[in-house]
């Protein structure tokens, strides 16, 4: 026997979308009498957000569908429905089961820089030097393509001196020097970095930009003939 069922549905789907089916068996006769005819109903929903009627169940098939708009994984990632199955077509004995509805993630949240402004100091001539770690927040499912950040230097790196990679665990952007900086040539660089996700956005979202002011520190260099 099974008293817990599991299903899933994408966040933001339209009412009428089918989620899953639950089934209860009854050995009694269902042809000549109603003794074995099972009727399904939803007894309760937890949590009751955004309200307590997000799902409906087909009385005779046990198919659970979305009845209301507003499924938002970032607010409620899982719903727990208590399902009642009653024989005699709803007038007889009742048994209960649990249906867990997992709300699947869509990339409906953009990563946002926090903070958006950074200042860093780098000794001149240093190659592969970690300049700054940039931090983003993203409300989508952790460690998924909708959460993982992709960083791009949009401006301020005319000499192609910098590179930025994504830390696989923290999701931070790690800004490093690709080649040595020359204090005597330019003692300050202002970089503009944009962040997006590995996965495309499912709707038009504003992209976040960070500004990094990099101060180049003078290193005493030997005289050259």
């Amino acid at each position: 026997t099974q008293d817990t069922f599991r299903g899933s549905v994408l966040e933001g789907v339209l009412p009428g979308t089918s989620v899953m089916q639950v089934t209860a068996t009854d050995e009694d006769d269902a042809i000549y009498t109603y003794n074995g005819v099972v009727a399904y109903s939803i007894h309760s929903q937890e949590p009751k957000d955004p309200h307590d009627l997000m799902f409906t169940i087909h009385r005779s098939t046990g198919t659970i569908s979305v009845i209301s708009s507003g499924l938002d994984r970032e607010k409620v990632p899982e719903y727990t429905l208590t399902i009642q199955a009653t024989d005699m077509d709803g007038d007889g004995s009742t048994t209960t089961a649990v249906a867990v509805v997992e709300i699947l993630d869509a990339n409906d949240n953009a990563p946002m820089f926090d903070p958006q402004k950074y200042e860093a100091h780098v000794p001149e001539n240093a190659v592969g030097h970690e300049v700054q770690r940039l931090t983003v927040t993203d409300l989508d499912a952790p460690n998924s393509p909708a959460w993982r950040a992709t960083y791009l230097i949009m401006g301020g790196d005319d000499g192609d001196h910098f590179t930025i990679t994504t830390h696989p665990e923290s999701n931070q952007g790690i800004l490093t020097t690709r080649k040595g900086l020359d204090f005597e040539a330019k003692n300050q660089h202002t970089l503009y970095v944009e962040v997006t996700n590995e996965a495309p956005f499912v709707l038009k979202l504003p992209t976040s930009t960070a500004t990094i002011v990099v101060h180049v520190e003078d290193v005493n260099e030997a005289p050259v003939f």
């Epitope: 026997t1 990632p77 649990v98 499912a141």
Partner: antibody, heavy 120, light 113 residues
Framework: QVQLQESGPGLVKPSETLSLTCTVS????????WTWIRQPAGKGLEWIGR???????NYTPSLKSRVTMSVDTSKNQFSLKLSSVTAADTAVYFC??????????????WGQGTLVTVSS | DIVMTQSPDSLAVSLGERATINCKSS????????????LAWYQQKPGQPPKLLIY???TRESGVPDRFSGSGSGTDFTLTISSLQAEDVAVYYC?????????FGQGTKVEIK
Amino acid sequence: QVQLQESGPGLVKPSETLSLTCTVSGGSINNYYWTWIRQPAGKGLEWIGRIYSSGSTNYTPSLKSRVTMSVDTSKNQFSLKLSSVTAADTAVYFCAREGYNDGYGYFDHWGQGTLVTVSS
Amino acid sequence: DIVMTQSPDSLAVSLGERATINCKSSQSVLYSSKNKNYLAWYQQKPGQPPKLLIYWASTRESGVPDRFSGSGSGTDFTLTISSLQAEDVAVYYCQQYYSTFRTFGQGTKVEIK
């Protein structure tokens, strides 16, 4: 590295309310379910309930009438309140994070646990 | 609730030998749409919180030695320690997360023979 730390009174009188707070450091409270689990001395683990960073909650049916959980994302904290306690609620209380890898449910980070004794 | 039953309650194994712990769920914890078993294994040493070893029945948590492995599907699962070390003495728990209401097995105590 994410770390969790429970805090609250170690002694609660019968019929009163047990209150515990878990402080999360080294990571954000956002995007995850945060859980309370208890363990009576020499016994197994009992799941009490969980709260999502948005405030959405689930409680174990046997304790549902007595449990309230809350979250404060600005402080990176979440809390447990268990009302009308009896000696049977004496246990080590753990806070934990539900990890995520294509689904929630397993506990990948735990607090050290705090012993709560119910006694007059 | 889904009831998790572990066997044996305790076992004594010689150093370097294989230790096998079984876990049975009262209903299947396999979600066929994802082809994943919603089952985890933990290790708990005295005075410490449990430590995650395995999730999705067979995925080893980062940093866990490869002598620990998980297997099984549906209702029957196994945690295997291929070559028992002194530091593996602990109580081991299985846990299902197929249901919202998470439940643990009663625990299996592993000692050195």
